[in-house]
């Protein structure tokens, strides 16, 4: 029985050209996390494997950085990055847990203050 729950950063509104962190946290289960996939729509952005570490998809290498933790940092945001992002936790023995985060990327005049900083 799958007892775990995924908590996310929550939906985010960010500024074009800026950076944001997407994070998920799996709680309420003792299942072992074997791999975390980060996806947008049907595109794989990155994989964090418990044994093999991080793999960033070649098409996102310039703009996606691993971490912090099992999270993902998106840099040099464009309006085209607006959309839904998925953290997919592969666990044993529970199976798969999925978290969802919607990111809205706006021109600088309307982006929320909290997401305006650049992450080093």
């Amino acid at each position: 029985m799958m007892t775990g729950t995924i908590e996310t950063t929550g939906n985010i509104s960010a500024e074009k050209g800026g950076s944001i962190i997407l994070q998920c946290h799996l709680s309420s289960t003792t299942a072992q996390v074997t791999q975390v996939n980060w996806e947008q729509q049907d595109q794989l952005l990155a994989i964090c494997n418990a044994d093999l570490g991080w793999h960033i998809s070649p098409s996102f290498k310039d703009r996606v950085a691993p971490g912090p933790g099992l999270g993902l940092t998106l840099q040099s945001l464009t309006v085209n990055d607006t959309g839904e992002y998925f953290c997919i936790y592969h666990t044993y023995p529970d199976g798969t847990y999925t978290g969802r985060i919607f990111l809205e990327v706006l021109e600088s005049s309307v982006a929320e203050h909290g997401a305006r900083f650049q992450i080093p």
Epitope: N11, S13, Q41, E84, E104, L106, V110, G114
Partner: antibody
């Protein structure tokens, strides 16, 4: 003036599919998310999903995945929601609603489209 | 999904009354950047829902200042300071912080 004009009421048979349109005017269509909301049983409001006109990206309430398909035609500034394999449970009023930038709220709503599923 | 609970379900009022509607969520509506996406709507019979308040406490354009929103975390309140006839209808809160967005069950504001 921002306006969202929806297509008229529909009476459809169980098992059929149908498409509701929502024509936007008075603003830059590609600059704002478009949401779809179901009002059933008089008072209950449910978020069906959204579409990003700029890139065609979608997000669905899992309850409506496979039931609703969202698309846009940028050339006519129109959003569409197709409802599939209709049953009596799908009888409701459906609204399109523009997303308020930055705040994940819905600032302008269409007038609603009443859908009745009956044989 | 985040469960949003509104109270009361029904609110009988007299014109001129001050009323409060409560909205509670099953988890915090503050995102990791400290922004809280909680909005309020009025749905009058035969009309479309209309946005009243967004981001907890910001009045949408054209909304009278007798409407005010407050709260944080999981507890939020809509206050109407002096009820007028045009305020009657169903009030809904909506959380937009977590996917999927979810509405409260609604509060019916009606005459005593």
């Amino acid at each position: 003036e921002v306006q969202l004009q929806q297509s008229g009421p529909e009476l459809v048979k169980p098992g059929a599919s149908m498409k509701i349109s929502c024509k936007a005017s008075g603003y830059s269509f590609t600059g704002y998310i478009m949401n779809w909301v179901k009002q059933s049983h008089g008072d209950n409001l449910e978020w069906i999903g959204l579409i990003v006109p700029y890139n065609g990206g979608t997000s669905y309430n899992l309850k409506f995945k496979g039931k609703a398909t969202l698309t846009v035609d940028k050339s006519s500034s129109t959003a569409y929601m197709e409802l599939l394999s209709l049953t009596s449970e799908d009888s409701a009023v459906y609204y399109c609603a523009r997303g308020l930038q930055r705040f994940y709220a819905m600032d302008y709503w269409g007038q609603g489209t009443s859908v009745t599923v009956s044989s | 999904d985040v469960v949003v609970t509104q109270t009361p379900l029904s609110l009988p009022v007299s014109f001129g009354d001050q009323v409060s509607i409560s909205c509670r969520s099953s988890q915090s509506l503050a995102n990791s950047y400290g922004n809280t996406y909680l909005s309020w709507y009025l749905h009058k019979p035969g009309q479309s829902p209309q946005l009243l308040i967004y981001g907890i406490s910001n009045r949408f354009s054209g909304v009278p200042d007798r409407f005010s929103g407050s709260g944080s975390g999981t507890d939020f309140t809509l206050k109407i300071s002096t009820i007028k006839p045009e305020d009657l209808g169903m009030y809904y809160c909506l959380q937009g912080t977590h996917q999927p967005p979810t509405f409260g069950g609604g509060t019916k504001l009606e005459i005593k």
